[in-house]
Amino acid sequence: KKVVLGKKGDTVELTCNASQKKNTQFHWKNSNQIKILGIQGLFLTKGPSKLSDRADSRKSLWDQGCFSMIIKNLKIEDSDTYICEVENKKEEVELLVFGLTANSDTHLLEGQSLTLTLESPPGSSPSVKCRSPGGKNIQGGRTISVPQLERQDSGTWTCTVSQDQKTVEFKIDIVVLAFQKASSTVYKKEGEQVEFSFPLAFTLEKLTGSGELWWQAERASSSKSWITFDLKNKEVSVKRVTQDPKLQMGKKLPLHLTLPQALPQYAGSGNLTLALEAKTGKLHQEVNLVVMRATQFQENLTCEVWGPTSPKLTLSLKLENKGATVSKQAKAVWVLNPEAGMWQCLLSDSGQVLLESNIKVVPTW
């Protein structure tokens, strides 16, 4: 008995060939011996089965001895053994129809779980193997679960259902709703304008929701809201902004915030949360601000940084075109009685300069 696997909603062709390449009488029946379709004279006739409105045959191939039955818009309950009667012989074809669907919306927030459920005919024992766009392989039976979706899980998932050495492939498009980056750090000299950008890792025709930037300044004892906003069809409108600092927000996507001046009291880390309409949960992006200040006071030249810096970062004071350098894995360095000239304060990570500030030391007579 031949086994054919089909996909729910698809079309399948069950073949039946006569030994002689000529038009002859044939019938397709189900396992209950109910006629589905056949030939009477030169005409296709249909029986009383539930399939009658979805079953057809290729008339153009009859004179080649090919009497296939085509079933459109397959349903799980179409799974059955079908019998083709032609030239006094019977050919049996077992059709197994499977469906694979996501249990929820296919637009899911990062960190949420994805469950794929296999619909299968009674008595079947299929196995399912899914491959994510990032190459992750997951296996399961009737259900496949991905507990925590990541950005890289966005795209087309390819799932293969296997039964009796036969396979059928499903493709499911999953959109993981997330920001492009989980975290970003902006390095600025004191007084410079700061630009924060929060690009999304997905595109939606209509994007509506609301959000907030919640900030923990390094020097502050508690965190606070810097700005709240609404998003209507990709248009941004500010709801409430703190008095200090007075942030500005772009009216279009990507979400874009401008801090007029980088000041030590603003250095710290923030969390931008975005809630999307009809979704429970929020998208998050962490943003850090590191601020550098170089000052000369009396005989002391000091360079300081504020904000979240890793312990492996190096802070240096260096006299331009001279070898004089003081370096520390600390948040402040200083030189007593510095030589006159242009001094550079550098914040670097393994030799790569992240931030630099120049200060001119004038000779004292």
Epitope: T208, G209, S210, A220, S225, T228, T242, Q243, A275, G281
Partner: antibody
Framework: EVQVVESGGGLVQPGGSLRLSCAAS????????MSWVRQAPGKGLEWVAN????????YYVDSVKGRFTISRDNAKNSLYLQMNSLRAEDTAVYYC????????????WGQGTLVTVSS | DIQMTQSPSSVSGSVGDRVTITCRAS??????LAWYQQKPGKAPKLLIF???SLQSGVPSRFSGSGSGTDFTLTISSLQPEDFATYYC?????????FGQGTKVQIK
Amino acid sequence: EVQVVESGGGLVQPGGSLRLSCAASGFTFSSYWMSWVRQAPGKGLEWVANIKEEGSEKYYVDSVKGRFTISRDNAKNSLYLQMNSLRAEDTAVYYCVREGGQWLALDYWGQGTLVTVSS
Amino acid sequence: DIQMTQSPSSVSGSVGDRVTITCRASQGISSWLAWYQQKPGKAPKLLIFGASSLQSGVPSRFSGSGSGTDFTLTISSLQPEDFATYYCQQANSFPWTFGQGTKVQIK
């Protein structure tokens, strides 16, 4: 520790006036919007008014507009509610609340002060 | 003004029960919704902000969901200290408005 403490409640005749005060501590008062919320005996919560950090914006529920005035003194870490032309339906426990929670939530509430308007 | 309608107005449950309270806004409020718990003679306490985020220090048995006009507060396993009145509140537009409250009582 964040604390908000209300005072000034009491018994007042209809048509009379009362001034409620709220003393805040444990946070930078001048950085937060503040609200007054009331609760009539055995009833639910009703937001009354709020005021921006530096006092430039004030909002009221319709039922108190023109009768109540919210104000603040950031130097004294204090919030006030001046209530004039009081009515029996203004009888309630009045809470001073910090609007400092994420997503504009009301995160710290005082213990409340009872205002009774009765002849 | 935006009307907030809570249901049911009261619910009886036993320790360990799952309790769900719904809140409906008369117009869309995105995720500008908070849930509060109030015990007799005490000030309200913030539980959930932004429709679904848990306030620091609040037990994880409390959860919030929804956006737009329909919101839900769920207590997954009722504890003795959870018997109280719960209020939803919108912060989408002035005046801020509260639901009428849902009293969770012992069965």
